[in-house]
Each structure stands twice: as structure tokens, then as C-alpha cells.
């Protein structure tokens, strides 16, 4: 009988043999930032290193009653929830606990930042296998912390945090803000979001990935074998770091930004009953809850790619929203959405040597959002070919004209108010994939990439009579990088990828009084690389 | 995730006063900037991070510091430097009365000013 | 080898009180922990408490609390349970037995027959 | 409090039968269960340590099994000095140690 949540990220293979994944997570440490825990406790004693960092405020009141087990409680369930003998998710990892949360699991900024330095201070002097740094806390959004937190990210280190208990945006949040932390909420064992009294998980943009988070079995600190059930994102944050350890264990050379592909990509999809979040929250909320690889093979050979959406641009008329991809991936391609349907597109521009998605909003727009396709492509060279507007009634054109580059996304940006009142173009021409075409009174954007062995190809799905939504999705073993809506007209909401669906979304027609006559369709682009292909097939 | 323009509380305190002469002056146009939770229940005022420019040297932690300290007595302040960061970001952390920031701010080498808040288990 | 060989049972009359003795040789006194258990005539197992003799600390069973009391004599590698107030319903072979907390109880003395009776 | 209920109460077997007694915790315990026999007039011996290990000396016809909250204490093949009371134990914290009510195995 293994608890629902062990259950629940094990793939159908493993679950035969009880819960007995390979290895363990035993190349890997995970440091744990939280209250001091019970070293002893059979469920990690012998694998827990109790370091001797120690930086808490003062507890709370002037009858306060430091009582150990009370002080232990909440380190100690997580310390087994990652790593527990019987109730963890990474039985063989090991764990070197800090402790930066009082007895009423209280801390400060200050406290943690001096923690993770303590982290990297190790790290230089005994340089070890992969790190994991767990961070089963939250404060208010801040700066420096998250900082920080990208620093030693930086340095090779992966982070995981609890997206926070508020019932909130985890973007308001720290670190759940950071791009860099892999962000955790909770579902429960139906796959809903977990109510918290009368708050719960947070949700939005800055979430990564789902985990368990409610009703987790796990070691508690009033005795040496007892268990407890407990409740939270920082349980949810412990079955990724456990599920992180055991990736990392297999796959040692493993960076941030491989890893978090490779936690998307397994993660079950689509499962998580949105209703339970804010409507304005729900697109930006991914549903993803994390689950172990179904095996340990070298995954490598699948081009991943996520979605990253940029924080929501204001109302006034010239905001912009960018999204950025992370350190080690390659925007393939950009798109936009505005729920007013008012927005003058996007576009690839460079930053810093490095290129970010930019969405434009318009006039009387309420806000737009910028959506990143980021990927993961050794050897990938990409460059942005643009079209003005044409002006003609075919609309704009523009393709992907070097040797050896293939189309992988379109974007389209436009500086009149409303392309509605202008005359659409027909739908792109059959048998031309590296061609993208868009509204003639827009600048066409193509995103043209080289990588060995990279091929594409442009999937459509049009439907004559309007839709407030339109799907197109890659077929096993292509992937999407590319997601785009024709035409440009004004009743578009904008598109995005969601896994390796391409979404375009319009507005209700019957309520903007727009003839049936304007259909949509949704063009996805869908890659793969032979080249990592044959790479996996020489290493099978 | 967030941007660092993002939703927090920021108050930009662009000052080029130059009571403390020119050595205490930032470069030219530059302003340092301070921020602080926007939870109010969970500020911590009284210790603030001081956070230096990213290719600040590691020495020049310990002597903005000082610098600080210096300062501030003369002008009647007791300050207490907790903590000198070197491995993660250049900066310090210091506790002082809320009275010192406008003087803090104008610290060479200061790229923003935060002040501590509490985080909690989740 | 590991021996821990009871003493001190016998019949007492209702209201009475003894000390029963556990003597223990064969390993380091200080590592284990000795619980004390009693099983009455025909029935099963029963913890009253246990005294780990590193440190002198004890824990009772909340119905033996006012009842029961153990300590230790290190020099003599001995442990003690005093039982006062004693009713028929306290007859019952005692036993000592010593384990790591959260550990199995992995040696047991031979047990002490406790008789309460006028 | 964990309650750990036996079955069967009592069991009557012949020898070179097998026995098969279970335990189940109104708790998860992970595989923190210790199993006990005890013949009359002897003190409990540990038979099984953490769910399914067996303690030194213990012959290998006695096994265990099971983690979380169902066990089982298996004996493949009785023979006549396996007739006896067996218990099983776990850790709590109030009180710290809790024993099952037992089950007798007795000759047909």
C-alpha cells in the first residue's frame, strides 16, 4: 500500500515492483532550507547531514515554548518526502538540511540569502556531483532574493520552491517569482488544486509544474518512526526535488534548463481541473503535474520545448510585455494574446546578445501578453527574416532564404489600431513550409534556425465558420515550436502553445456582431532532429 | 517568471545631493533604487541588503560598508554590519535606522537598497 | 552475550508497592534504551515505560504515570521500576526489555511474576 | 493512537501447514513493524525486524511482508516448536510503543 502521491508520479512500469525506481537519486545532494528537523528519524537518519548553518529571527511572542518536535515538524516531513526510506520520492538521495525557518517556521530574506550563500561557499570549496537546493518557503516578491537565487542557478545549482499557500499570483511572490527556481504548486489526489482553509495553491505564469500536495505522508518529528499527513506547496516542491534527484542521478550532466524540459515533458498534462483558478489565470496557469521519467533513458534524443509567458504588458497604449527564454534555450518563436483583442502583434528582437519575445498592446487594448516558445536545440543558429507590410491583397510574405534554415515560428506586428477594418488575405498557399504569410497591412517576422538535422514542417487547421477557439496539434515524435493564427483580423485573440498544441483564440463572434464570414485557422509549425534521433538510437 | 520591473513596491530615490562631496556621489546620472515588500505585515524595517553593481570587486563590499558606518556616525547613527556577501552578489547586509537610506543610496558602487521581510513555510 | 535478567517480583499485598531490579551485561549500558512491558494472566502485551540510562530520561504510559517510576544505577548497569498503589488488576509477569527508540525490542529478560493479592 | 489489529484471533494448523497471520495498522507506518513469538511461560522473542527482516537466529521458514499499513507475518512450513502466540509492534508517539492483541497458533 504506497501512499496516493508516491503513486501518483510512478509511471505504470515501476508500480509492479511497489515503488523501487532505480538508483535513487543517490549521485545527487539536496540541500533543505527550512526549520531544523529530527536527524534521527528512521525514515533519513543516515542520510541526512545536519549542517551547521543556523540563521532564524526570534520566535513570536513572549510565552513562546520551544518544544523539538514542534521546531522539527515541518523540515522533517519534507526531509522524508524527499528522501525518505519508506514515504520518499528519492530514497537514495542525500540531504544536508539548513536551518532558516524558527520553530513557527518563520524567517527572514536576509536569513535565506546568507543560506544559499553558505550553499555556494560550499560549492567552491568541495565541488560535489548535482545539487539540488530546495525552498519550501515564500515571502513577498523581492528583488535581491530572487537574485540570488538566479546567481546560484547560474552556478550550476538547480532550485526548487513552493509556489506559496495564498490562494494567489506566485509571481506576487519570492522566490516563486524567479525565472531561474523551478516553481512547484499542489493538486491533490483528484487532481485539483489544494484548498488550503480558505486559501491554497498559488497558480499563474510563474508556476513551472504541479506536484501532490495534500494529504502527504511523510516523516513526523514526534517520534523516530512515526508519520504524519501534511499539507502544502512545499510538499508539492519536495516531490520535484526527489523526482529532480532521481533525474539528475541518472543523467549527472543534466543543466537547469534540461531538466525543467525534461519535467514538463513528463509531467502528466492536462489533468488539473481549471475551473478552480481565476478565468484570467487559467491560460497562464500550466496544467502539468510532475511525474518520474517512465524509465532511465537517456532522454536526449527529443527536441523539448516549453511555453513561457511574459508578465501582462498594462493598458496604456505603447506597453509592451516581453518573454524571455532561459540562459541555455532558443526562442524558436514568438506569439501574442490580448483578451480584449486588442494588440498590434509581436515580434523577435535581440537583447543583451540574447533574443526575447516582444508583444505590442493598442489603443484602448486592455494589456498584452508575450509568449516565448523556448527550446532545447544543440548547435542551433537562428536569425529573424522580416517582410513590411505589402500593402497588396495576398498579403505579406516572407520565408526562410539561407541554406540549410527551416522555418520554426511566424510573427506578425502591425502599427494600425484595428486590421479589422482592412481586407484579410487568403490562407498561405499550399506546398510552401518555410513561408510565412500574414495581414498586408503587417511586418511579417520569420524565426529561421539551423541545427543538425533539424527539419520542420507547417501543420493548418481552418475552419470555415468562426470558433472561439482553434486547435492544431504535432503528431507523436515532432514537436511544437511554432504557433500562429491567420489571418491577422481583430476578432484573433492572439495564439500559444499549450505542450504540443497550437491554440488560437478568437472573440465570441456573436457578441462582436462580425459576419461569419471571417474563419480562422491555427498553424502550427512542428519540428524534430534526426540528428538527435541517431544520436539516441547509437547510445540505445 | 517575474521580471525584475515587476510587482513590488519600488521607491526610486534619485538623489545627487552633495553634502557628503563628490567621493560619495554615484557616477553621473546614476540612481540607486530602494525597494521593500509590498506586504506591509511582513516588512522587517530596521536591516536593510545593500546590494553593489555586478562587476563591483569583492573588496570593495567590506569598504562601502565601512564607508556606510563611517558616515552615519557622523551623523549620530550606530550601525551594525551583519553580514558581508561575497559568493552570490556583492553586498552586505546591514541593520541601521531607516533615517540612513537617502545616505546609503548615494554609496558609490550602490546598485539598489532592500529591505528585509519574513518568508514562511509553506 | 546480550543478558538483561529480572528481579524482585513476588506477591504484594493491594496498596503495596515494589522495585522490581533489571540487571544488563553484554553490550554498552548507555547505548540502549530499557523499556519495561507486563502481561497479565492470559492476556497480551502491555508498554508502562522505558528510561534511556545515557541521560536518565524517562516516558511512561499515561495510565502508569502515577504509578509507575524508573531509574537506573549506571555503576551498577541496573534499571528499576517502582510500582506503588498496587491493585489486583496489576498482577502480571514484568518484563525489561532494551532497543534503540524506533528500533525493534531485540533482548528480553526472563520476566518477573507480580502477584497482588490479600 | 495507532491501533494494530491481528488476525486471526486464533489459528489452528498442523505442522508442515502454512501460517499466515496479518497486521494491519489504523495508520500508515512505513515498514517500521516488528514482529514477536511467545511461548507460554517464555518471554516475547523478535522474530521479524522492520516489516521483513528476520532477526539473528531466526530460521527461514518465518517471513514478512508489506509496508504502510497491511502486514503479514508468514511461516512457510509449521513445525511443532512454532506453536505459540505471535505479536506485532510498532512505534507511536503517545503512547511510544503499541502492540497488536495477538494471535495464538495452535495444533489442529
Known amino acids: 500500500s504506497i501512499p496516493w502521491n508516491l503513486e501518483r508520479i510512478t509511471p505504470a512500469r515501476y508500480r509492479a515492483d511497489e515503488y523501487q525506481p532505480p538508483k535513487g537519486g543517490s549521485l545527487v545532494e539536496v540541500y533543505l532550507l527550512d526549520t531544523s528537523i529530527q536527524s534521527d528519524h528512521r525514515e533519513i537518519e543516515g542520510r541526512v547531514m545536519v549542517t551547521d548553518f543556523e540563521s532564524v529571527p526570534e520566535e513570536d511572542g513572549t510565552r513562546f515554548h520551544r518544544q523539538a518536535s514542534k521546531c522539527d515538524s515541518h523540515g522533517t516531513h519534507l526531509a522524508g518526502v524527499v528522501s525518505g526510506r519508506d514515504a520518499g520520492v528519492a530514497k537514495g538521495a542525500g540531504l544536508r538540511s539548513l536551518r532558516v525557518l524558527n520553530c513557527q517556521g518563520k524567517g527572514t530574506v536576509s536569513g535565506t540569502l546568507i543560506g544559499l550563500e553558505f550553499i555556494r561557499k560550499s560549492q567552491l570549496v568541495q565541488p560535489v556531483g548535482p545539487l539540488v537546493v530546495l525552498l519550501p518557503l515564500a515571502g513577498g516578491y523581492s528583488r535581491v532574493f530572487n537574485a540570488a537565487c538566479q546567481r546560484l542557478a547560474r552556478a550550476g545549482v538547480v532550485l526548487v520552491t513552493a509556489a506559496g499557500n495564498f490562494r494567489d499570483d506566485a509571481c506576487l511572490y519570492s522566490p516563486a517569482s524567479a525565472p531561474e527556481v523551478i516553481t512547484v504548486g499542489a493538486t491533490n489526489a483528484q487532481d485539483q488544486p489544494v484548498t488550503l482553509g480558505t486559501l491554497g495553491t498559488n497558480f499563474g505564469r510563474c508556476v513551472d509544474l504541479f506536484a501532490p500536495g495534500e494529504d502527504i505522508i511523510g516523516a513526523s518529528s514526534d517520534c523516530s518512526t512515526c508519520f504524519v499527513s501534511r499539507s502544502g506547496t512545499s510538499q508539492a516542491a519536495a516531490h520535484v526535488a526527489g523526482i529532480a534527484a532521481m533525474m539528475l542521478s541518472a543523467e549527472p550532466e543534466l543543466t537547469l534548463a534540461e531538466l525543467r524540459q525534461r519535467l514538463i515533458h513528463f509531467s502528466a498534462k492536462d489533468v488539473i481541473n481549471e475551473a478552480w483558478f481565476p478565468e484570467d489565470q487559467r491560460v497562464l496557469t500550466p496544467n502539468l503535474v510532475a511525474a518520474l521519467p517512465p524509465s532511465t533513458h537517456r532522454a536526449g534524443w527529443q527536441l523539448f520545448c516549453r511555453t513561457v509567458w511574459s508578465a501582462h504588458s498594462g493598458p496604456t497604449r505603447m506597453a509592451t510585455a516581453v518573454a524571455r527564454c532561459a540562459q541555455d534555450e532558443e526562442l524558436l518563436s514568438c506569439s501574442s494574446f490580448s483578451r480584449s483583442g486588442k494588440r498590434r502583434g509581436e515580434r523577435i528582437e535581440a537583447q543583451g546578445g540574447k533574443r526575447v519575445c516582444r508583444a505590442h498592446n493598442a489603443f484602448g487594448g486592455e494589456g498584452v501578453y508575450a509568449i516565448a516558445r523556448c527550446c532545447l536545440l544543440p548547435q542551433v543558429n537562428c536569425s529573424v527574416h522580416t517582410a513590411p507590410p505589402a500593402g497588396a491583397s495576398m498579403g505579406t510574405r516572407v520565408h526562410c532564404h539561407q541554406q540549410g534554415h527551416v522555418l520554426t515560428g511566424c510573427s506578425s506586428h502591425w502599427e494600425v489600431e484595428d486590421l479589422g477594418t482592412h481586407k484579410p488575405p487568403v490562407l498561405r498557399p499550399r506546398g510552401q513550409p518555410n513561408q510565412c504569410v500574414g495581414h498586408r497591412e503587417a511586418s511579417i517576422h520569420a524565426s529561421c534556425c539551423h541545427a543538425p538535422g533539424l527539419e520542420c514542417k507547417v501543420k493548418e487547421h481552418g475552419i470555415p465558420a468562426p470558433q472561439e477557439q482553434v486547435i492544431v496539434a504535432c503528431e507523436d515524435g515532432w514537436t511544437l515550436t511554432g504557433c500562429s493564427p491567420l489571418p491577422g483580423t481583430s476578432h484573433v485573440l492572439g495564439a500559444y502553445a499549450v505542450d504540443n498544441t497550437c491554440v488560437v483564440r478568437s472573440r465570441d463572434v456573436s457578441t462582436t456582431g462580425s459576419t461569419s464570414k471571417e474563419a480562422v485557422a491555427a498553424v502550427a509549425i512542428c519540428c524534430r532532429s534526426r540528428h538527435l534521433v541517431q544520436a539516441s538510437q547509437e547510445l540505445q | 517568471q517575474e521580471d525584475e520591473d515587476g510587482d513590488y513596491e519600488e521607491l526610486v530615490l534619485a538623489l545627487r545631493s552633495e553634502e557628503d562631496g563628490l567621493a560619495d556621489a554615484p557616477e553621473h546620472g546614476a540612481t540607486a533604487t530602494f525597494h521593500r515588500c509590498a506586504k506591509d505585515p511582513w516588512r522587517l524595517p530596521g536591516t536593510y541588503v545593500v546590494v553593489l553593481k555586478e562587476e563591483t570587486h569583492r573588496s570593495q563590499s567590506e569598504r562601502t560598508a565601512r564607508r556606510l558606518q563611517a558616515q552615519a556616525a557622523r551623523r549620530g547613527y550606530l550601525t551594525k554590519i551583519l553580514h558581508v556577501f561575497h559568493h552570490l552578489l556583492p553586498g552586505f547586509l546591514v541593520k541601521m535606522s531607516g533615517d540612513l537610506l537617502e545616505l546609503a543610496l548615494k554609496l558609490p558602487h550602490v546598485d539598489y537598497i532592500e529591505e528585509d521581510s519574513s518568508v514562511f513555510a509553506q | 552475550q546480550v543478558q538483561l535478567l529480572e528481579s524482585g517480583g513476588g506477591l504484594v499485598q493491594p496498596g503495596g508497592s515494589l522495585r522490581l531490579s533489571c540487571k544488563a551485561s553484554?553490550?554498552?549500558?548507555?547505548?540502549?534504551?530499557i523499556y519495561w512491558v507486563r502481561q497479565a494472566p492470559g492476556k497480551g502485551l502491555e508498554w508502562i515505560g522505558w528510561i534511556d540510562p545515557g541521560n536518565g530520561g524517562t516516558r511512561y504510559n499515561q495510565k502508569f504515570q502515577s504509578k509507575a517510576t524508573i531509574s537506573r544505577d549506571n555503576s551498577k548497569n541496573t534499571l528499576y521500576l517502582q510500582m506503588n498503589s498496587l491493585r489486583a488488576e496489576d498482577t502480571a509477569v514484568y518484563y525489561c526489555a532494551r532497543a534503540r527508540v524506533g528500533y525493534s525490542l531485540d533482548y528480553w529478560g526472563q520476566g518477573t511474576l507480580v502477584t497482588v493479592s490479600s | 493512537e495507532i491501533v494494530l489489529t491481528q488476525s486471526p484471533a486464533t489459528l489452528s494448523l498442523s505442522p508442515g501447514e502454512r501460517a499466515t497471520i496479518t497486521c494491519r495498522a489504523s495508520q500508515y507506518v512505513g515498514s517500521y513493524l516488528n514482529w514477536y513469538q511467545q511461548k507460554p511461560g517464555q518471554a516475547p522473542r523478535l522474530l521479524i525486524y522492520d516489516a521483513s527482516n528476520r532477526a539473528t537466529g531466526i530460521p527461514a521458514r518465518f517471513s514478512g511482508s508489506g509496508s504502510g499499513t497491511d502486514f503479514t507475518l508468514t511461516i512457510s512450513s509449521l513445525e511443532p516448536e512454532d506453536f505459540a502466540v505471535y505479536y506485532c509492534q510498532v512505534w507511536d508517539s503517545s503512547p511510544p510503543v503499541v502492540f497488536g492483541g495477538g494471535t495464538k497458533v495452535e495444533i489442529k
Open positions: 553484554g553490550y554498552t549500558f548507555s547505548s540502549y534504551s
